[in-house]
């Protein structure tokens, strides 16, 4: 039975040209996290595997940095980065948990950054 829940940074906004941290946290389960995938729509951004470490997709290498923790930092944001982002936790024995974050990249300087937190 899957008892875990994923907390995310929810809906966030950021300025064009800036950077933002996408963060998820899996709680309420003792399942072992074997891998976390970060995806934008159906496109793979990055993988963090407990054994193999980080892999950033080649097409995002210049603008995506691993961390902090199992999170992902997006840099040099453009309005095209607006959209849904998913953290997909692969766990044993529970299976897969998915969290959703909506990022809006704004042209103006009035962007309000959503709450951020780090995994200790």
């Amino acid at each position: 039975m899957m008892t875990g829940t994923i907390e995310t940074t929810g809906n966030i906004s950021a300025e064009k040209g800036g950077s933002i941290i996408l963060q998820c946290h899996l709680s309420s389960t003792t399942a072992q996290v074997t891998q976390v995938n970060w995806e934008q729509q159906d496109q793979l951004l990055a993988i963090c595997n407990a054994d193999l470490g980080w892999h950033i997709s080649p097409s995002f290498k210049d603008r995506v940095a691993p961390g902090p923790g199992l999170g992902l930092t997006l840099q040099s944001l453009t309005v095209n980065d607006t959209g849904e982002y998913f953290c997909i936790y692969h766990t044993y024995p529970d299976g897969t948990y998915t969290g959703r974050i909506f990022l809006e990249v704004l042209e103006s300087s009035v962007a309000e950054h959503g709450a951020r937190f780090q995994i200790p």
Partner: antibody, heavy 118, light 110 residues
């Protein structure tokens, strides 16, 4: 150019020891996952051992068939990967390749031959 | 014995499309990324496909993959004589903490 060059293979008696070396050029071994993979004569590929990049937990992993007998290590100043092989058995006879990479091994050496026979 | 099962041999004529299968348990294939290696006669293996479907630079798009349920396959279209080689599928097993290779498939270009 990114290259790997293995050495240290040879003929050894059962129960004996060998140390294989893998000299890297064009990249720094401590920054990457490094593995040893072997291939017995006329057979397929068999994973032997992997060491993680020093930036990621610094783990080492071994196949059950070599656990307790083989040890993977690296010398960062020499930019070289090693495989210390003790208690060698006839079934360890193979070409031993070192390889670089975590999400797929994208650079391989040419291999060094280890023969275990009395 | 390998956790990943491949046919020992496959063949085709120049220009043809050939496929090489790789099968395993649902856990192995379905929830893990698959990798493919090519080993030309007398040479070291070469990474052909990583993360299920990604080709390293220099690998032609004649090589493609698919994955469904408990099996996966490597397809080679427009077969060429230089494609004659051994092909291996592989995956990283998070529970064994190690790489698992298929037994390999010897591809002959007739």
């Amino acid at each position: 150019e990114v290259q790997l060059l293995e050495s240290g293979g040879g003929l050894v008696q059962p129960g004996g020891s060998l140390r294989l070396s893998c000299a890297a050029s064009g990249f720094t071994v401590s920054d990457h996952y490094m593995s040893w993979v072997r291939q017995a004569p006329g057979k397929g590929l068999e994973w032997v051992s992997t060491t993680s990049s020093t930036s990621w937990k610094n783990y080492t992993y071994y196949a059950d068939s070599v656990k307790g007998r083989f040890s993977i290590s690296r010398d960062n100043s020499e930019n070289t990967l090693y495989l210390q092989m003790n208690g060698l058995r006839a079934e360890d006879t193979a070409v031993y390749y070192c390889a670089k990479g975590s999400y797929g091994m994208d650079v391989w050496g040419q291999g060094t031959t280890v023969t275990v026979s009395s | 014995q390998s956790v990943l099962t491949q046919p020992p041999s496959a063949s085709g004529t120049p220009g043809q499309r050939v496929t090489i299968s790789c099968s395993g348990s649902n856990f192995n294939i379905g929830t893990k990324y698959l990798y493919w290696y090519q080993q030309l006669p007398g040479t070291a293996p070469k990474l052909l496909i990583y993360l299920d479907s990604q080709r390293p630079s220099g690998v032609p798009d004649r090589f493609s993959t698919s994955k469904s349920g408990t099996s996966a396959s490597l397809a080679i279209s427009g077969l060429q004589s230089e494609d004659e080689a051994d092909y291996y599928c592989a995956l990283w097993d998070d529970h064994l903490h190690g790489w698992v290779f298929g037994g390999g498939t010897k591809l002959t270009v007739l």
